[in-house]
């Protein structure tokens, strides 16, 4: 009996036309939502004038439906048993699941000012930037609508630059009508233990953002894993959102709509400093902000963002060192709300429920040549927003899963 089930599972999780896995893989049957909480800055003037702690108040959720588009350019390669594809991006606002509208206003860090002052450190260039920033009446902070902040707005300061520069700024700009990839993953035909594992991303096996092993593209995209998952396993996956591979470890058994699943979580060790977790040495890319690589819980992904000083963390700086959150007032990290988990059905390796949580932060530094930054006396890693991307298997799919997979085994 067991061998027959194993044989059936192995057949059905292969990523090729006609299998259960393929159908759900091409277009997820799960409704996926991305909730945003924006950190509204309460004291912009005090920060700019006196280098005070930044007082933030989170506002949300603002919810979008995501991952509803089928994978594109799906191409099988029989020679190396891989399938390549693009994952198109799309987001639809869900007013009924949101606390307000996309037109709601927020006081947030001025993304262009923070980025330009970081990218162009030459003193003379900073004086020119100062002229452009002041001329455009830009400041250290700005008021933007949710739609502008997420999906893009024409920045008045960048619009003054007479060279061809991108004048549109947004945390997720461009998003709609774009795609992530090309991904090339193993289809599992020759070796089921490699199914869904990424072979190449954008044509490469490495990212070119990090040194050494940190630069590797490991595991799957977390939507599924090779079948027959063991509790002792460390599940590796790659997330283009954070420009790196990461891992999850078993935490507990969970019953999801009558289906026994394993809950895997991202451990605090994954965010530790190299002092505590030597494997993380290559995620420390500079010495000053990281206080000689002793700070933890924030990831500098500027190399992946054209030099813009973007730092990724867990929401509310969960698992981050005290020095990171010290200049920010109003944060309340807690594991239950702010950690990332994957609920994996161990036989098939399918992720039946997940909550991916991350926070987008921007570094802003003092600059004696830029008027709106010259009163700052310290660096700030400023939280802009955090997101919670969730998906849960639907009741109908769960019934089918129970009858066809877990029911047969039990």
């Amino acid at each position: 009996g067991d061998l027959l089930i194993q044989k059936t599972i192995k057949k059905q999780v292969v990523l090729e036309e006609g299998t259960i896995a393929f159908k759900n893989w091409v277009k997820t049957g799960t409704e996926v939502y991305r909730q945003f909480w924006i950190f509204d800055v309460q004291n912009p003037q005090e920060v700019m004038m006196n280098s005070s702690n930044i007082q933030v108040k989170q506002r949300g959720p603002y919810t979008y439906r995501v991952r509803f588009l089928a994978k594109e350019n799906v191409t099988q390669d029989a020679e190396d048993n891989t399938v390549s594809f693009l994952q198109p991006n799309g987001a639809i606002f869900e007013p009924s699941l949101s606390v307000g509208t996309e037109a709601d206003n927020f006081t947030v860090l001025n993304l262009a000012v923070a980025a330009a002052s970081h990218i162009y450190q030459n003193q003379f260039v900073q004086m020119i930037l100062n002229s452009l920033i002041n001329k455009s009446k830009s400041s250290m902070f700005q008021v933007r609508t949710l739609r502008e902040l997420l999906w893009g707005y024409r920045d008045p300061f960048l619009s003054l630059v007479p060279y061809p520069v991108t004048t549109t700024v947004g945390l997720f700009y461009p998003y709609n009508n774009t795609a992530d990839g090309v991904y090339k993953v193993f289809n599992g035909k020759d070796n089921i233990s490699k199914v869904a594992i990424i072979d190449t991303y954008k044509g490469k096996r490495n990212l070119s953002y990090w040194e050494s092993h940190c630069d590797m593209i490991n595991g799957t995209d977390a939507a599924s894993f090779p079948p027959f998952v063991e509790k002792s396993q460390v599940l590796q996956f790659f997330s283009s959102d954070i420009c790196r591979s990461i891992y999850a470890v078993f935490e507990s058994d969970v019953n999801l709509k009558g289906i026994p699943v394993y809950r895997f979580v991202l451990p605090s060790k994954a965010f530790a400093s190299p002092v505590e977790n030597p494997d993380n040495y290559c995620f420390c890319t500079e010495k000053i902000i990281s206080k000689n690589c002793t700070s933890y819980g924030v990831l500098d992904i500027s190399k992946c963002k054209e030099g813009r000083p973007v730092y990724i963390s867990l929401p509310h700086f969960l698992y981050a060192s005290p020095d990171v959150s010290e200049p920010i007032d109003g944060l309340n990290p807690n594991e239950e709300e702010h950690r990332t988990y994957l609920d994996i059905e161990p036989i098939t390796g399918f992720t039946l429920q997940f909550a991916k949580r991350l926070q987008v932060n921007l570094l802003v530094k003092p600059s004696e040549k830029i008027q709106v930054l010259k009163n700052l006396k310290r660096n700030y890693i400023v939280p802009i927003l955090w997101l919670n991307e969730t998906g849960t298997i639907g009741d109908e799919k769960a019934n089918m899963f129970r009858s066809q997979v877990t029911g047969k085994i039990n």
């Epitope: 003037q45 003379f124 004086m127 020119i128 100062n130 002229s131 452009l132 920033i133 002041n134 001329k135 009446k137 400041s139 902070f141 003054l160 630059v161 007479p162 060279y163 008027q371």
Partner: antibody, heavy 122, light 111 residues
Amino acid sequence: QVQLQQSGSELRSPGSSVKLSCKDFDSEVFPIAYMSWVRQKPGHGFEWIGDILPSIGSTIYGEKFEDKATLDADTVSNTAYLELNSLTSEDSAIYYCARDYYGSSYGYFDVWGAGTTVTVPS
Amino acid sequence: DIVLTQSPASLAVSLGQRATISCRASESVDSYGNSFMHWYQQKPGQPPKLLIYRASNLESGIPARFSGSGSRTDFTLTINPVEADDVATYYCQQSNEDPYTFGGGTKLEIK
């Protein structure tokens, strides 16, 4: 002492063009401070023509002057230029260059040239 | 364009008295806690001279007899006490929005 030195008066016939110059003696501030051009017609108020950030040549024009004026700057000689084309008697005025407050770029002018009188007979 | 209306068009004040000139903007000239309204003095045959910047800041070298106040759309230049050397035309100017615009001027005379 003179900080902005403007070129001398100009008499031009209708339909012609004229190029006015404004030399800045502060070579440190010139590249990083917006230089504006403002005109004052006899018995009238002031009209802002536009401005230029010399270091990168970034210009903004008042809508009224978009087809009338061209701003330019040379960071070697620290000189800003205003060219006016298709002159009519309506363009007769005193033209001032005015530098933004020590590179603050907030649009107020602490240094002005003495002005150049342009006369276009009707 | 933002229209600046100055009043009065002219005023005569006795030496040692207070002169008050008003400037009203057709829309707010405030951004990020700053009022981008400035005041100049112009004497015949001379270029304008900056007196007050950003509504209330006194330009260096300008006597403290000159002061500015106001926000959003209503601004005032005050000269107290008036001296003989203050005979001139006074202009307000906004730089909150391109194109920058000037008021029509207020001519100050001594009674």
